[in-house]
Each structure stands twice: as C-alpha cells, then as structure tokens.
C-alpha cells in the first residue's frame, strides 16, 4: 500500500508548487523502510556496493560538473543548476567559460578554471580550508571540499557569492540520491537537508540512509555487521 | 576607511639603494586575499608595476626588474617595505603603493604617492 | 608579457559627448582586464574590474564591455571631473600590466 500526502512547497525557482510525496507503508504497521534501514535491517546497499547506487551517483556527479549558478536577476536568491533549468531572461547564468575563470592559484595567474561557479562557495573566498600550496583545489566542482571558513567580507563582488543561496544537497529516498533543493521541499520530502554544503558531491546521501555507524570511506558501504543485527 | 601613504627619500644618487615604505590603515594585511603592492609612474608615462606581498607573505615581482627588487612587510605595524638597490636615472618617478586582492588581482586603494628622483 | 594597446592616445571632447576609449591585448586575456582613471596630479582610481563589472562608488556613466583581445571603456556624457588619463591594466598572467593610457582632455 501506497501513503500520498500532497502539499504546496516552496520549489527552486522560488515558487510555491504542489508536490506529492509517495510513502510505501509498512504491511505490518511498523516503522516505514527508512526507519528499519537505520536500525539496522539487511539492506544490501549498505552492505556492499550496489551497481545500480553507483551508476546513479556517478551520472548525478557528471551533470554537476557541468552545473553552474542561477542568479535571479530580481536579486531573490541563486541556485546550482543546468544551463537548461535556468531562465535566459529572468537569471543570470554563472559559468566560468572561454577564460572567465579565476586563476587556479596566484602563483599561475595564467592557468584559468573552467569548472564552476558554485553558489555560496569559491577558491578565492574560502579560508578553511583555503585553496594554495599543496592543497589548491581541482579543477572539478565535483572535487571541491565544503568551505568550513568564509573570507570575512559581506560582499565580494561576485554575483555566485553574494546572492540568497535558495538550495543546498538534499539526500532522498532509500537510494541515497541527492539534489539541491529547498529545505522545505527536502523536509516534506521527508529528506536529509546538508546546510554545510553546497554541492551534491560533497555529501555521501548513502551514508545518511544507512545510520549505524559511518562508512570507512564514505564512499564504500562496509556495514557487514548488519548481517547479525536483523 | 582605506588609506595608504606613501614616504620615500626624495632624492638620491645612481648606483644608491632605494628605500620606500608603504604605511595604511583600515585593513590588515593578515586579511585572507588581500596584498600591498608597488606601481610606479615615471612623469607623464604609463603606469608599471613592481612588485606584491600578501597575507601569507607570498611576493611577486615584476621579473625585469626582480633582481633589485625587495619587498617585505611589517604586520603588526601596517608597513610595507620596498627596496631597489643599484639606482638609475631611469628610476626617477613617483612610486604608488596600492592594495590587491586576489578576488581579481585589480588595485582597488592607491596612496597618493611619493616623488624620488634619481640625480648625479 | 602582455601588452596593452590604448587608443585613441588623446581624446579631446566636450562635458556631454559620449566617448569610447579602447584596450587591446597582445593575446587572448579572457575577461581579466580593469580599467583606471587618474586626474590631473591624484593617484588611479579603480573604475572597472573583471572588463565589465561596476566599482561602488562610481558614476553610472562609466561602464566596460568586451573580452579577449578588445575591451572598451564607455563615458556616457563626460562631464568636467571626468578629464585626465585612462589606463587598463590585465590580470590574465604575471607580471601584471598596464596599457600606455588614453588622455581625455577638454576640446
């Protein structure tokens, strides 16, 4: 049996929508599927890697390297998305292209990023951890690491930095996938809503849905011990 | 609000040191991403530029002039220092001290500048 | 290095006109150039950065446009503060430099 609940939930674009959310209920009238994974039920995902879970991972990671900054040009707020998913006429699209990038370190002025922008995140504004010396951050959003320390300056001129961040990761469903949305689309949803970061690549949505205790590597379920707890 | 001035000795002989400092207020140069740099403008020329320190005592120099060059920072103080050695008539000019960010490696403050004269 | 080409090297106009003043790089510099105005005996003053972007504090009137190689500094009816000397400066690659600058003097 199905559980529908309907509701109108601010959405990305900053408009209310109406959405639906689909429960499958428990035929025993127990704690739904989210529930029993993090208490510890057999779910295969969380135990080995699941090649339908990465393939789903690894195609969302392809379409976020390629996403950029959707700046509304009424200045109500910014989002990460495709070029697609952003209005030509009512936004403004920031993607660093044919040289617009900033330097990959002030060392190289001359070697220019490509990948990004980021809403709410930049090499050239993160303190912490700050991108130089050895640890300059790649050229691949999907890479970066969450900024724990902003620059202290309210504004830096940079219209990815200085807008109304209107998304963030958000981790649904059972099979760990991620988007950017809005915390009230991500809490109806009945989702993980990530406030620290800014791009599905630097959350591991698996992780989240397993519980228990984290992964080794959050990229690699490990949960074995999973065969002894149900 | 953002100031930097500028003091130098006026004038001084070929082959002598150049010693100039950079005193400002309004920021901090242990601010991340920002820097204290020098630009120089030779009467009614263009505008060149020397060197750069950062917060994280990074320098840059302009690489034909990089072997006279010194550049250094007092922090605490709010000083910056630059030092050309082996003077020339050539170098006459009046020296700037700009502050750069490394959000787009503009000047975005400039002293008032110091006139040096190099003469015989 | 990168060289900047200014031109016109002297402009002479009247407070109202519309100008253009013009950068040209010696190589493809993306949008990583800044554009600086410097009156009569004062020190530059950031006008522009990043070819196009607006410096708070300054006049409307003053607005950049172009990428590459050829950028333009746009003075939409000059008024008498306006007069005095026009530099663009590329932040592409060290060293950093400047154009010879473009003079903008009464008519």
């Known amino acids: 049996a199905q559980h529908v609940t309907t509701q109108l939930v601010l959405r990305n674009k900053g408009v209310y929508e109406s959405v639906k959310y689909i429960q499958q209920e428990n035929f025993w009238i127990g704690p739904s599927s989210i529930d029993l994974i993090h208490l510890g039920a057999k779910f295969s995902p969380c135990i080995r890697k699941d090649q339908q879970i990465e393939q789903l991972v690894l195609r969302e990671r392809d379409l976020e390297r390629d996403s950029g900054c959707c700046v509304q040009n009424d200045h109500s707020g910014c989002i990460q998305t495709q070029r697609k998913d952003c209005s030509e006429t009512l936004a403004t699209f920031v993607k660093w292209q044919d040289d617009t990038g900033p330097p990959m370190d002030k060392s190289d002025l001359g070697q220019k990023r490509t990948s990004g922008a980021v809403c709410h995140q930049d090499p050239r504004t993160c303190e912490e951890p700050a991108s130089s010396g050895a640890h300059i951050w790649p050229d691949d959003i999907t890479k970066w690491p969450i900024c724990t320390e902003q620059a202290k300056s309210n504004r830096t001129g940079f219209l990815h930095m200085d807008c109304q961040i209107k998304g963030r990761p958000c981790c649904i469903s059972t099979k760990g996938s991620c988007e950017i949305t809005t915390r009230e689309y991500c809490e109806f949803m009945h989702g993980y809503f990530h406030e620290e970061a800014t791009l599905c690549s630097q959350v591991h949505c698996l992780d989240k849905v397993c519980g228990l205790l984290p992964f080794l590597n959050p990229e690699v379920p490990d949960q074995f011990y999973r065969l002894w707890l149900s | 609000q953002v100031t930097l001035k500028e003091s130098g000795p006026g004038i001084l002989q070929p082959s002598q040191t150049l010693s100039l400092t950079c005193s400002f207020s309004g920021f901090s140069l242990s601010t991340f991403a920002l820097g204290v740099g020098w630009i120089r403008q030779p009467s009614g020329r263009g505008l060149e530029w020397l060197a750069h320190?950062?917060?994280?005592?990074?320098?840059y120099y302009n690489p034909a002039l990089k072997s006279r060059l010194t550049i250094s920072k007092d922090t605490s103080k709010n000083h910056v220092f630059l030092k050309i050695a082996n003077v020339d008539t050539a170098d006459t000019a009046t020296y700037y001290c700009?502050?750069?960010?490394?959000?787009?490696?503009?000047?975005?403050?400039w002293g008032q500048g110091t006139s040096v004269t190099v003469s015989s | 290095d990168i060289v900047l080409s200014q031109s016109p090297a002297t402009l002479s106009v009247t407070p109202g006109d519309s100008v253009s003043l013009f950068c040209r790089a010696s190589?493809?510099?993306?949008?990583?150039l800044h554009w600086y105005q410097q009156e009569s005996h004062a020190s530059p003053r950031l006008l522009i950065k990043y070819a196009s972007q607006s410096i708070s504090g300054i006049p409307s009137r003053f607005s950049g446009s172009g990428s590459g190689t050829d950028f333009t500094l746009s003075i939409n009816s000059v008024e008498t503060e306006d007069f005095g000397m026009y530099f663009c400066?590329?932040?592409?690659?060290?060293?950093?430099?400047f154009g010879a600058g473009t003079k903008l003097e009464l008519k």
């Open positions: 700009a502050r750069i960010t490394t959000y787009y490696y503009g000047m975005d403050y």
């Open positions: 400066q590329q932040s592409y690659n060290w060293p950093l430099t």
């Open positions: 190589q493809s510099i993306g949008n990583h």
């Open positions: 320190i950062w917060w994280d005592d990074d320098k």
